[in-house]
């Protein structure tokens, strides 16, 4: 059974031309480190993406076809997320267990660069995506996924890792960003908000979505994650926005129905294997791509982010379950687990489709075209 999904024909969030500057003060959610303009000592700039050596071609995979009859989102609101809170809610929960207060958190102290210097780097994630400023890169071909439809056995580990819900993926899930850019999926996790407050990490024209899924991949050029951290293209994350729709999403329900079992920080359970690709949008051909970082400490850079243009729909009840079931550190609900958007600092977001071409009346100013720097051009 396919998911109810929304098909974006115009770019997410509509479009208007603008500068490559970070969002204003109104878009500082639960963040702790103010964006830095200069490099921290010893942090290298990681400019364009490099092709990684020693990689073989993946078996050819047929890209997903566009679904017919899916909803259009011509009028997605482009307003700022209203009053993103500075800190997550702190609700009393069972007995206190805190030790020292040096661990990183969403909101409040300590500032992330003090926790991990890389968090002050120039090329951090998440970012605000401005479709009008994205560079159309015809070389960005549809993503290729192989082996993502998992059988029920062996079961997978679903865990409350303290700041998110995380599903560990078995070996054999292959993903290609393009020729010679092959990856293996490692895990997926989610970011969300709270009741009535959106919690995606990336934003589009300042619009924050209810939630966001990240599927983390390791380049086949590396044997281990710690070897790949900080290396350009060492890690790749597929990101998709989750939105509210009228129907229950059956794929997500397989995970959401088990959250009660892992309400406690650090707890885990086993869930049957499922079709991981069903958690993602169906259109693998339209996406934005840029080089950024992990969105939590250690904030390692060199991560290739691919953000789908199409969104995934969950029911209101499912989004509520996601944001209202888990507990995190300090006896607080695990909510609002997203980092503020970070400055682009000269980075150009690339698009696999002409995202800057928008016939809507919003695009009154001339479209600023950025040049395509994609690998393979």
């Amino acid at each position: 059974q396919r998911l109810p999904r929304m098909q974006e024909d115009s770019p997410l969030g509509g479009g208007s031309s603008g500068e490559d500057d970070p969002l204003g003060e109104e878009d500082l959610p639960s963040e702790e480190d103010s964006p830095r303009e200069e490099d921290p000592p010893g942090e290298e700039d990681l400019p364009g993406e490099e092709d990684l050596p020693g990689e073989e071609d993946l078996p050819e995979v047929k890209p997903k076809s566009e679904e017919e009859g899916s909803l259009k989102l011509e009028d997605l609101p482009t307003v700022e997320a209203p009053g993103d809170p500075q800190e997550p809610q702190n609700n009393a929960h069972r007995d206190k267990e805190g030790d020292d207060q040096s661990h990183w958190r969403y909101g409040g102290d300590p500032p992330w660069p003090r926790v991990s210097p890389a968090c002050a780097g120039r090329f951090q994630s998440p970012v605000d995506i401005r479709p009008q400023l994205a560079a159309f890169c015809p070389a960005l071909r549809p993503l290729e996924l192989l082996g993502f439809q998992l059988p029920p056995l062996p079961e997978l580990r679903l865990r409350n890792n303290g700041h998110s819900v995380q599903l560990t993926l078995p070996p054999g899930l292959e993903m290609a960003l393009g020729p010679g850019r092959e990856y293996r999926a490692l895990q997926l996790h989610l970011h969300w908000g709270a009741a009535g407050r959106p919690g995606s990490e990336h934003t589009v024209e300042g619009h924050r979505f209810p939630a966001e899924i990240h599927v983390v991949h390791l380049s086949t050029a590396f044997a281990r994650v710690d070897e790949a951290l900080g290396r350009p293209g060492g890690l790749a994350v597929l990101a998709a926005f989750l939105e509210e729709g009228p129907e229950e999403n059956s794929a997500y329900e397989q995970l959401l129905s088990r959250l009660e079992e892992i309400a406690e920080e650090g707890s885990e359970t086993q869930v049957p294997g499922l079709d991981i690709s069903a958690l993602l949008p169906s259109d693998f051909s339209r996406y934005f791509q840029y080089e950024g970082s992990l969105t939590t400490p250690p904030c390692a850079q060199g991560v290739i982010w691919t953000v789908f243009n199409q969104t995934v729909m969950l029911s209101a009840k499912q989004l509520h379950t996601l944001s209202d079931t888990l507990w995190g550190p300090g006896d607080s609900r695990l909510q609002l687990n997203f980092r503020a958007t970070q400055p682009l600092n000269g980075r150009v977001i690339e698009a696999s489709f002409p995202a800057g071409v928008d016939s809507s009346p919003r695009a009154a100013e001339p479209v600023q075209l950025n040049s395509c720097l994609a690998a393979g051009d």
Epitope: S102, G266, A300
Partner: nanobody
Framework: QVKLEESGGDLVQPGGSLRLSCAAS????????IGWFRQAPGKEREGVSC????????YYADSVKGRFTISRDNAKNMVYLQMNSLKPEDTAIYYC??????????????????????????WGQGTQVTVSS
């Protein structure tokens, strides 16, 4: 070859002290949370103390607070567990474990210390600690 290896376990009298060592080889602990776990006969494995190399945060189980101290030697890629005022109930096999810290793995040291099953990235073989007179 990537591995964790514990050492330092021994037979000690109640009230005595021991220092356990965990040597990481084949990888650096820089991006990891490191935990000491123990399993007594007939009991579940429990997290004793956990430490994050990323943000320096530490966690101790209530049963060992004030008696045990976790530390790391960056140059030697080692993690230690200093155990003082040992009690008979501290008798167990002690394991060292490491898992990526942050969104890629375990995001808090409390969560790390609740990994009672060998689901972490790396686990050692264990070292026996016996507290008896």
């Amino acid at each position: 070859q990537v591995k964790l290896e514990e050492s330092g376990g021994d037979l000690v009298q109640p009230g005595g002290s021991l220092r356990l060592s965990c040597a990481a080889s084949g990888f650096t602990l820089d991006y990891y949370a490191i935990g000491w776990f123990r399993q007594a006969p007939g009991k579940e494995r429990e997290g004793v103390s956990c430490f994050s190399s990323v943000d320096g945060s530490t966690y101790y189980a209530d049963s060992v607070k004030g008696r045990f101290t976790i530390s790391r030697d960056n140059a030697k890629n080692m993690v230690y567990l200093q155990m003082n005022s040992l009690k008979p109930e501290d008798t167990a096999i002690y394991y060292c474990a490491a898992e990526l810290y942050g969104e890629l793995g375990v995001a808090t040291v409390q969560a790390m210390c609740r990994l009672t099953t060998p689901g972490g990235d790396y686990w050692g073989q264990g070292t026996q600690v016996t507290v008896s007179s």
